[in-house]
């Protein structure tokens, strides 16, 4: 059943669910700061547009009475609890800034008819794809699978002349929330990645991963994993690695690669890092001072969520349209709005598009260098470094299956 | 975090969660009647034992504000919601008569530290196995898999001289809650059933099922499905069936086979029905007058849940032991108590044991007849009809794989 909304007569509210369980271990004060910074910007933009309205956020906190707190694995019902709280308090805004945990978001769509828009800084899993009123402001797993398939198939770059069709995936279950769902999507037999590969095997034990590095009978030279360089080092250490092994390290929400004076450790030489280019303006933002490089994207997603709310409000008010309609609920997609850090594009399903960046370690400079970029909006790869100083033979990525000649 | 309990000083309460979402579409009044009938019996038993205490139930209803109502598929968070409600109202009893939906029960264990005992009339899925404070009073999926594996392997009965190691499973997703989890357990690659079979294929489309019935290239003669005869008829109709096909119809909670004047329709001749023998006393019970044959077991499980609560209360009070301890919470297992209908045995994991009954259709009398019984407690099959009047050749069950001679 539906909940009455604080969303009319010149007063517009966004309900922000402040969850005990979150995709990133970010203090809730930082999230609140990001939201408030966003509200300031929105008020300014609406005022500049001659729209004299009040815009606020109501923060709904979990009471922590019965939930195991912490990561997303025990978050399933927390979003629904907060929705019930909102419903009892008659405090639903025009928009819900919802859970970042996939389990929680999925459950809200499973158990209720959500007829108002929900914005999420997370909800990475495939189970949150194609939700008609959900907008996700951090790259969901589906976008990762699109990149990987595109990159695997690519064979027309100076440094990649082989199409790949095989892969190992390392997934030990201790991953962060984003990695957990990214790897789930690669593992899922129904996913695009699995569908397009002729061989894929999930490695779950450290030893399995370590053995593959020098195994002459391995079925693929490519290993996908998710985490930061430290995570890889714990696993790989300084072990020898066969010369045609390529490790793809997915680390989308980590700006550290772009910081000054960062040197790539030696164990990263066989590794391509998939990340996103950082937004500069955020580095100097008032609310981001206490944020680690891995947290900026999360805070930024909250901030951009508020700006998106403002953008939609402005659009509908300027057109004299009602905000509490299904049309509004379904409108948070297939658009570009002015984010904190530049234009933000949402696809037909409300998922953020971005430019992913594939980095390699230069054997000359020991620096991370951009190999190529990938635009998720048009599913297109653009080579950046035409002659990378790779560790691999002839400065080209090897084939995914080593030709061992007659056996 | 824990909730204070109404469970001391001679006053003992059981909290009964009255869910919108339930494993069986049973009006909540009937559940309430069953609980109240149980309380009357418990009060009598405690009085007879010289224990002068008050025993009550508090019924906790969902407010229906945000949940999709109906079946268990959207029940995940309802149990937690009610637990939150209990927690806010400070109304937790000594025991929780919890959700019947697997999703809901599983989530309660996932998201909270349940340190009080929970009794469920349902929670059939494998994901609710081995929960230290959960007692299930209707046969869970694990027990079904034990029977099937035992029966498949059996080859020393007059009417079954072949071990089977293959099966089709029909599962189209429209099943009732019990069937949904029973079939899930057969489908799951990690389950005992899958583990012990050399071939197993899930048929999801009606046409797949219908084609198998006469397919010369089928990989197994055995098809497991779940539902009542009507469900089978909708699927199979009056189609011809190869003579060595055996359909196992799982219909555990349906007493209609044992009613007087029931004739087995012709389409049931290739079918073995797995059910449970009904309790006679329930048929004349005051609260069961409005119950259909398929609902009696559900109501009985609630009634027996109250009797189990009474039994444990009596045991602990007679021994002068504290009720609000972990010992009490973990004690609802590995015991036999006096149920409404005779002794009820719980295994080491708090799951009810029962006598399953395999029925066949006599080609002479067109009646359902008991072929064998299976005691889940000792994992033992007892043949009942040594010379069944089967439809199958030589009145013996065929091999699961037809020998087609040289191809």
């Amino acid at each position: 059943s539906q909940v009455s909304q604080n969303c009319h007569n010149g007063s517009y509210e966004i309900s922000v669910l402040m969850m005990d369980n979150s995709a990133f271990a970010e203090p809730l004060e930082n999230v609140e700061d990001a939201v408030n910074e966003g509200l300031e910007i929105v008020r300014g933009r609406l005022q500049n547009a001659g729209l004299n309205v009040t815009v606020n956020a109501s923060f709904m906190y979990s009471d922590g009475l019965i939930h195991n707190s912490g990561d997303c694995r025990s978050s399933t019902c927390e979003g629904l609890d907060l929705l019930r709280k909102i419903s009892n308090a008659k405090r639903m805004g025009c928009v819900l800034m919802g859970p970042s945990c996939t389990y929680s978001t999925f459950q809200m769509y499973l158990d209720t008819e959500l007829s108002y828009p929900m914005i999420s800084a997370g909800s990475f899993g495939l189970s949150c794809d194609y939700k008609e009123t959900l907008t996700r402001l951090m790259s969901p797993a589906r976008k990762l699978t699109y990149f990987l398939v595109n990159f695997w198939k690519t064979n027309d770059l100076p440094f990649k002349t082989y199409s790949w069709s095989t892969s190992y995936v390392y997934k030990n279950g201790t991953e962060s929330e984003d990695c957990f769902w990214y790897l789930n999507a690669l593992e899922a037999s129904v996913s695009y990645f699995s569908h397009e590969l002729s061989f894929k095997l999930v490695l779950r034990q450290d030893k399995e991963f370590q053995d593959i590095l020098m195994d002459h009978n391995r079925k693929s030279n490519v290993i996908v994993m998710c985490g930061d360089p430290q995570f890889l080092y714990k696993l790989k250490g300084d072990r020898a690695v066969a010369e045609d092994i390529v490790i793809i390290l997915v680390d989308l929400f980590n700006d550290q690669y772009f910081e000054d004076n960062v040197t790539a450790p030696d164990y990263m030489k066989n590794v391509l890092v998939l990340t996103q280019s950082p937004g500069n303006s955020l580095l100097n933002s008032s609310f981001s001072r206490n944020l680690s490089p891995t947290k900026r994207d999360f805070a930024l997603a909250y901030l951009n969520g508020i700006l998106l709310f403002g953008h939609m409000l402005k659009t509908f008010l300027e057109n004299g349209e009602n905000i509490t309609t299904p049309k509004f609920a379904h409108a948070f997609r297939n658009l570009t709005f002015e984010g904190y850090d530049g234009p933000v594009t949402l696809d037909d399903w409300g998922d953020v598009d971005s430019t992913m960046v594939l980095l390699y370690t230069s054997v000359d400079t020991k620096k991370y260098k951009v190999l190529l970029t990938y635009d998720t909006h048009v599913n297109q790869t653009n080579p950046v470094d035409m002659s990378p100083t790779f560790t691999w033979k002839n400065s080209k990525l090897p084939n995914d299956i080593t030709d061992r000649g007659p056996q | 975090s824990q909730v204070s309990q109404n469970c001391h000083n001679g006053s003992y309460e059981i909290s009964v969660l009255m869910m919108d979402n339930s494993a069986f579409a049973e009006p909540l009044e009937n559940v309430e009647d069953a609980v109240n009938e149980g309380l009357e019996i418990v009060r009598g038993r405690l009085q007879n034992a010289g224990l002068n205490v008050t025993v009550n139930a508090s019924f906790m209803y969902s407010d229906g504000l945000i949940h999709n109502s109906g079946d268990c598929r959207s029940s995940t968070c309802e149990g937690l919601d009610l637990l939150r409600k209990i927690s806010n109202a400070k109304r937790m009893g000594c025991v929780l008569m919890g959700p019947s939906c697997t999703y809901s029960t599983f989530q309660m264990y996932l998201d909270t530290e349940l340190s009080y005992p929970m009794i469920s009339a349902g929670s059939f899925g494998l994901s609710c196995d081995y929960k230290e404070t959960l007692t299930r009073l209707m046969s869970p999926a694990r027990k079904l898999t034990y029977f099937l594996v035992n029966f498949w392997k059996t080859n020393d009965l007059p009417f079954k001289t072949y071990s089977w190691s293959t099966s089709y499973v029909y599962k189209n997703g429209t099943e009732s809650e019990d069937c949904f989890w029973y079939l899930n357990a057969l489908e799951a690659s990690v389950s005992y059933f899958s583990h012990e079979l050399s071939f197993k294929l899930v048929l999801r489309q009606d046409k797949e099922f219908q084609d198998i019935l006469m397919d010369h290239n089928r990989k197994s003669n055995v098809i497991v499905m779940c539902g009542d005869p009507q469900f089978l008829y909708k699927l199979k109709g009056d189609r011809a069936v190869a003579e060595d096909i055996v359909i196992i119809l799982v219909d555990l909670f349906n007493d209609q086979y044992f009613e007087d004047n029931v004739t087995a329709p012709d389409y049931m001749k290739n079918v073995l029905v797995l059910t449970q023998s009904p309790g006679n006393s329930l048929l004349n019970s005051s609260f069961s007058r409005n119950l259909s044959p398929t609902k009696r077991d559900f109501a009985l499980a609630y009634l027996n849940g109250i009797l189990l609560f009474g039994h444990m209360l009596k045991t602990f009070l007679e021994n002068g032991e504290n009720i609000t301890t972990p010992k009490f919470a973990h004690a609802f297992r590995n015991l036999t108590f006096e149920g409404y209908d005779g002794p009820v045995t719980l295994d080491d994991w708090g799951d009810v044991d029962s006598t399953m009954v395999l029925l066949y259709t006599s080609v002479d009398t067109k009646k359902y007849k008991v072929l064998l019984t299976y005691d889940t407690h000792v994992n033992q099959t007892n043949p009942v009809d040594m010379s069944p009047t089967f439809t199958w050749k030589n009145s013996k069950l065929p091999n699961d794989i037809t020998d087609r001679g040289p191809q």
Epitope: V149, N150, F151, W152, K153, T154, N155, D156, L157, P158, K160, T161, S163, V370, N379, Q380, T381, N382, P383, V384, D385, M386, S387 | -
Partner: antibody, heavy 118, light 113 residues
Framework: QVQLVQSGAEVKKPGASVKVSCKAS????????MHWVRQAPGQGLEWMGI????????SYAQEFQGRVTMTRDTSTSTVYMELSSLRSEDTAVYYC???????????WGQGTLVTVSS | DIVMTQSPLSLPVTLGQPASISCRSS????????????LSWYHQRPGQSPRRLIY???NRDSGVPDRFSGSGSDTDFTLKISRVETEDVGIYYC?????????FGQGTKVEIK
């Protein structure tokens, strides 16, 4: 409209180097890769290499590796192709060609004739 | 590298008559990563730069007369001129951009009989 204007014809002695320029206009210079293609008299087209004007990175055809250098100047929207250790068989018309979509040459310069003769 | 083989190498044609040039690649030109086939045709008049006529097998560039059409798939491609005109003389090149590095056919010289 898109225009690629190349420098004029050159006559060089064997062993010398030549540097040909290609000035782009009518589009965002750093948004499109640039290729160099040459054509010896009466012969077909031969791809020489590619430059990314955005970062300056390059990739060259195997047969020119070590002899060719491609550079760019973003301030003047110009790319350069320098070929060293010239031999008589390097006599050809050298074209710059814009990459409209990866490895698709949509616009060509007018060509620069380089003659290598002693 | 992918080898592109054109035939014929020389094509004398009558004005107003159709003409057809074939181009064969040593490997499939279907680019797996996006499902497109990057085969283009270029026309070079005597003393001029090449000009693109067709891209992605069959798409005509703007300003290219509709008497030019491209077809084919996998490894076999064809450029057709429905009615040859005087300005169509010159050399026609096919080029593949589906694999690295890009490669050209050796050219087909079209002249009026």
């Amino acid at each position: 409209q898109v225009q690629l204007v190349q420098s004029g014809a050159e006559v060089k002695k064997p062993g010398a180097s030549v540097k040909v320029s290609c000035k782009a206009s009518g589009y965002t210079f750093t948004s499109y890769y640039m290729h160099w293609v040459r054509q010896a008299p009466g012969q077909g087209l031969e791809w020489m290499g590619i430059i990314n004007p955005s970062g300056g990175s390059t990739s060259y055809a195997q047969e020119f590796q070590g002899r060719v250098t491609m550079t760019r100047d973003t301030s003047t929207s110009t790319v350069y192709m320098e070929l060293s250790s010239l031999r008589s068989e390097d006599t050809a018309v050298y074209y710059c060609a814009r990459d409209g979509q990866w490895l698709q040459f949509d616009y060509w310069g007018q060509g620069t004739l380089v003659t290598v003769s002693s | 590298d992918i080898v592109m083989t054109q035939s014929p190498l020389s094509l004398p044609v009558t004005l107003g008559q159709p003409a057809s040039i074939s181009c064969r690649s040593s490997q499939s030109l279907l680019k797996k990563s996006d499902g497109n086939t990057y085969l283009s045709w270029y026309h070079q008049r005597p003393g001029q730069s090449p000009r693109r006529l067709i891209y992605k097998v069959s798409n005509r560039d703007s300003g290219v007369p509709d008497r030019f059409s491209g077809s084919g798939s996998d490894t076999d491609f064809t450029l057709k001129i429905s009615r040859v005109e005087t300005e169509d003389v010159g050399i026609y090149y096919c080029m593949q951009g589906s694999h690295w590095p890009p490669t050209f056919g050796q050219g087909t010289k079209v002249e009026i009989k």
